[in-house]
Interface confidence: low
């Protein structure tokens, strides 16, 4: 089975952990893909470890576990994220997370007169 938190939120400028939880008594995870709007965020291969494309390498940190830590968030990062677990011999399991990046509360602070 595949479990995700479904909808998560984070603040602009902050970071968030994207995590999918896969459990099976019979299947072995061989590869995990993390994708955003048809863009590859990261790949984990059991054989070779993590690969993060250079376009995301300054903001995407592998882990914890088979999840991702997405840093320096902007409101443009709001949207759907997918984890694709390639398992052997069961095949593919896919999870979806919707991330809402909210404007920093600092934007709403009003300077009070001294």
């Amino acid at each position: 089975t595949m479990e995700t938190k479904g909808n998560i939120s984070a603040e602009e400028g902050g970071s968030v952990v994207l995590q999918c939880h896969f459990s099976s008594d019979t299947a072995e995870v061989t590869q995990v893909n993390w994708e955003q709007r048809d863009q590859l965020l990261a790949v984990y291969s059991v054989d070779l470890g993590w690969y993060v494309p250079s376009v995301f390498s300054d903001r995407v940190v592998p882990g914890p576990s088979l999840g991702l830590t997405f840093q320096s968030l902007t409101t443009n990062d709001t949207g759907e994220y997918f984890c694709t677990y390639h398992t052997y011999p069961d095949g593919i399991y896919k999870g979806r997370i919707f991330l809402k990046v909210q404007e920093s509360s600092a934007h709403f602070q009003i300077a009070l007169p001294g």
Epitope: E28, T30, Q31, N33, L40, V43, S45, V46, D47, L48, Y51, P53, S54, V55, Y88, P89
Partner: antibody, heavy 116, light 110 residues
């Protein structure tokens, strides 16, 4: 001596599934990546996909949903569904292809023609 | 997706010439690049791996260089048996890839 040999039908009808087998000797599939590549007549090399030592598979974007690569003890299989004339090509298997030391060796290739 | 762009697509040269073929990756592939030679009716043959390491049995007139996005295959003194088509191949990433090979460079007799 490391050897690879592709086999399968040379003629496949449109809309059917192309099935090929690569039989290997001289090394273990349990510790090797294996790639499938094809070459349409008079054209360049087209990567189809790769299977890892643990059975993990990676497929070319154009082939996703149509291709399946699997393996047994000394054979790697390729299945390509819903074929058209555009799938007519020489099909090769090769050892390696993903952060290894290149694809080496290659099988001699087998020509598959898609025609009714 | 990582695209591999080879140039030129074809070239004419004479025996003894120095020949250079270039391959450009659309993103950083570090040194994860191989070069192959293919003659008509034959399977490709590995020449160079990890951008600059000569494969076993390949003559020393072949050499490879580069890292990151720009790579070069050089034949220092072209021999009659070197007239063939040459391909580069990235092996850095195989997820979400259309083709790992460049489009090929045909080396013909002038």
């Amino acid at each position: 001596q490391v050897q690879l040999q592709e086999s399968g039908p040379g003629l496949v009808k449109p809309s059917e599934t192309l099935s090929l087998t690569c039989t290997v000797s001289g090394f273990s599939l349990s510790s090797s990546y294996m790639s499938w590549i094809r070459q349409p007549p008079g054209k360049g090399l087209e990567w189809i996909g790769i299977i890892g030592s643990n059975g993990n598979t990676y497929y070319a974007n154009w082939a996703k949903g149509r291709v399946t690569i699997s393996k047994s003890s000394n054979q790697v299989s390729l299945k390509l569904s819903s074929v058209t004339a555009a799938d007519t090509a020489v099909y090769y298997c090769a050892r390696g292809g993903y952060r290894t030391s290149g694809m080496d060796p290659w099988g001699q290739g087998t020509l598959v023609t898609v025609s009714s | 997706d990582i695209q591999m762009t080879q140039s030129p697509s074809s070239l004419s040269a004479s025996v003894g010439d120095r020949v250079t073929i270039t391959c450009q990756a659309s993103q950083n592939i570090y040194s994860d690049l191989a070069w192959y030679q293919q003659k008509p009716g034959k399977a490709p043959k590995l020449l160079i791996y990890r951008a600059s390491t000569l494969a076993s049995g390949v003559p020393s007139r072949f050499s490879g260089s580069g890292s990151g996005t720009d790579f070069t295959l050089t034949i220092s003194s072209l021999q009659p048996e070197d007239f063939a088509t040459y391909y580069c191949q990235q092996e850095h990433l195989v997820a979400w890839i259309y083709n790992v090979f460049g489009q090929g460079t045909k080396v013909e007799i002038k």
